[in-house]
């Protein structure tokens, strides 16, 4: 990738990412300096006859740097830290060849869970206030709710009204999704009324 | 049917606020977002941000943080955008867009032209 | 953020000719929505999650891709599909459009 448009690669919390190295064709590459945010994170010198000699500059991300026969950079157990600009310079004896990447870190999105505050109005119909929620949503997490195929809303809420003498039993279901991943929690209308009248009752006895 | 009803036209001088409305009718008002999408003239589309219409809660993008601000009247179904002191480079077509999910812009406002001129 | 790129920028065909138009994204999206636009209107929604016509969109248009490259074709146009129309990511925030190809009467 040039320098002018650096390569976005999203990586998976946890997980390993590649950031691919293209050489430059027929030339013998001097050496080979990889940076992240600006700061030197690897020097590689390529050798025709023996191993290459690699001296890992950065401690912290250090342990868990890797490079591929073509010196590509593997980052493994990624963390969310591990985000941001890295940079490639492959030296060679005529000129210096620039790759540029963006490193986006994802989490797989996990324990999606409803929260509901429903009410019981007079004339029997019930109001769903349902909540939906995962753990650690950033603003790359989308989220709406369903039900029979049709989109009910596109938040993490969903405000609805049921009647259960002249609808069916009804299950609402959220829907969380990211580049990554996606989740799904489903509800019954009739059971969360069921349990809304009973409180209404007792509180009424 | 569900629609958007935007405000009319605003000229306005450098300096100046204006406030943009986007009325909503014919759906639940409260369980869509609404995003605000900005077009310059002879421009692409520039999408600014969107506000929780059931928490009141905005999101920027980065290029819209500061002079301008989504707000919201839920007892009238209405999402304003307010954009405070006034730049020429602030004329532009703003469209208020209904979020369907996974933030596809299924209902749109029919805009309003904002003019910044001196 | 996710930049757009929409090729060709205009799109010179005559009425009955197949036109396809390619939006290339420089990080792997999840799904790509497309708009339609014509001069003095709104943006019209037109294909959602990368190969859903939206309501009351002809059946000559159709919507493929996955990861960085995702493509809008239309079999054979007709007069009304001349407009421009843009690409959109929802994967990441901000949610951003491609700069539009313009589909213009030879």
């Known amino acids: 990738q040039s320098s002018l448009t650096p390569l976005m690669v999203n990586g998976i919390l946890g997980e390993s990412v590649t950031l691919p190295l293209e050489f430059p064709a027929g030339e013998k590459v001097n050496f080979i300096t990889w940076l992240f945010n600006e700061t030197s994170l690897a020097f590689i010198v390529p050798h025709e006859t023996k191993s290459p000699e690699i001296h890992v500059t950065n401690p912290k991300q250090g342990k868990r740097l890797n490079f591929t026969q073509s010196y590509s950079l593997q980052l493994s157990n990624l963390k969310m830290e591990d985000t941001g600009s890295y940079r490639a310079q492959i030296s060679t004896k005529t000129s210096a060849k620039l790759s540029s990447y963006t490193l986006r870190i994802l989490r797989q999105l996990r324990n999606i869970q409803v929260t509901n505050h429903s009410q019981l109005f007079q004339n029997m119909t019930c109001e769903l206030h349902l909540t939906c929620s995962v753990e650690d949503a950033d603003d790359n997490v989308s989220f709406r709710w369903e039900a029979l195929g049709n989109t009910l809303s596109s938040q993490p809420n969903l405000t609805v009204s049921w009647d259960p003498r002249i609808s069916s039993e009804q299950d609402y279901t959220c829907i969380a999704e990211n580049a990554v991943s996606n989740l799904s929690f489903s509800v019954s209308a009739q059971k969360l009324c069921e349990d809304v009248k009973i409180q209404y009752t007792d509180t009424k006895m | 049917q569900v629609q958007l009803v935007q405000s009319g036209s605003e000229l306005k001088k450098p300096g100046a606020s204006v406030k943009v409305s986007c009325k909503a009718s014919?759906?639940?008002?409260?369980?869509?977002?609404m995003n605000w999408v900005r077009q310059a003239p002879g421009q692409g589309l520039e999408w600014m941000g969107w506000i929780n219409t059931y928490s009141g809660e905005p999101r920027y993008a980065d290029d819209f943080k500061g002079r301008f601000v989504f707000s919201l009247d839920t007892s009238v179904s209405t999402a304003y955008l307010q954009i405070s002191s006034l730049k020429a480079e602030d004329t532009a077509v703003y469209y208020c867009?209904?979020?369907?999910?996974?933030?596809?812009?299924?209902?749109w406002g029919q805009g309003t032209t904002v003019t910044v001129s001196s | 953020q996710i930049v757009l790129s929409q090729s060709p920028a205009t799109l010179s065909l005559s009425p009955g000719e197949r036109a396809t138009m390619s939006c290339r994204a420089s990080?792997?999206?999840?799904?790509m929505h497309w708009y339609q636009q014509k001069p003095g209107q709104a943006p019209r929604p037109w294909i959602y999650a990368t190969s859903n016509l939206a309501s009351g969109v002809p059946a000559r248009f159709s919507g493929s891709g996955s990861g960085t490259d995702y493509t809008l074709t239309i079999s054979s146009l007709e007069p009304e599909d001349f407009a421009v129309y843009y690409c959109q990511q929802w994967s990441s925030t901000p949610r951003t459009f491609g700069g539009g190809t313009k589909v213009e009467i030879k």
């Open positions: 990080s792997s999206v999840s799904h």
């Open positions: 867009a209904r979020d369907y999910g996974r933030w596809y812009f299924d209902v």
């Open positions: 014919g759906y639940t008002f409260t369980n869509y977002g």
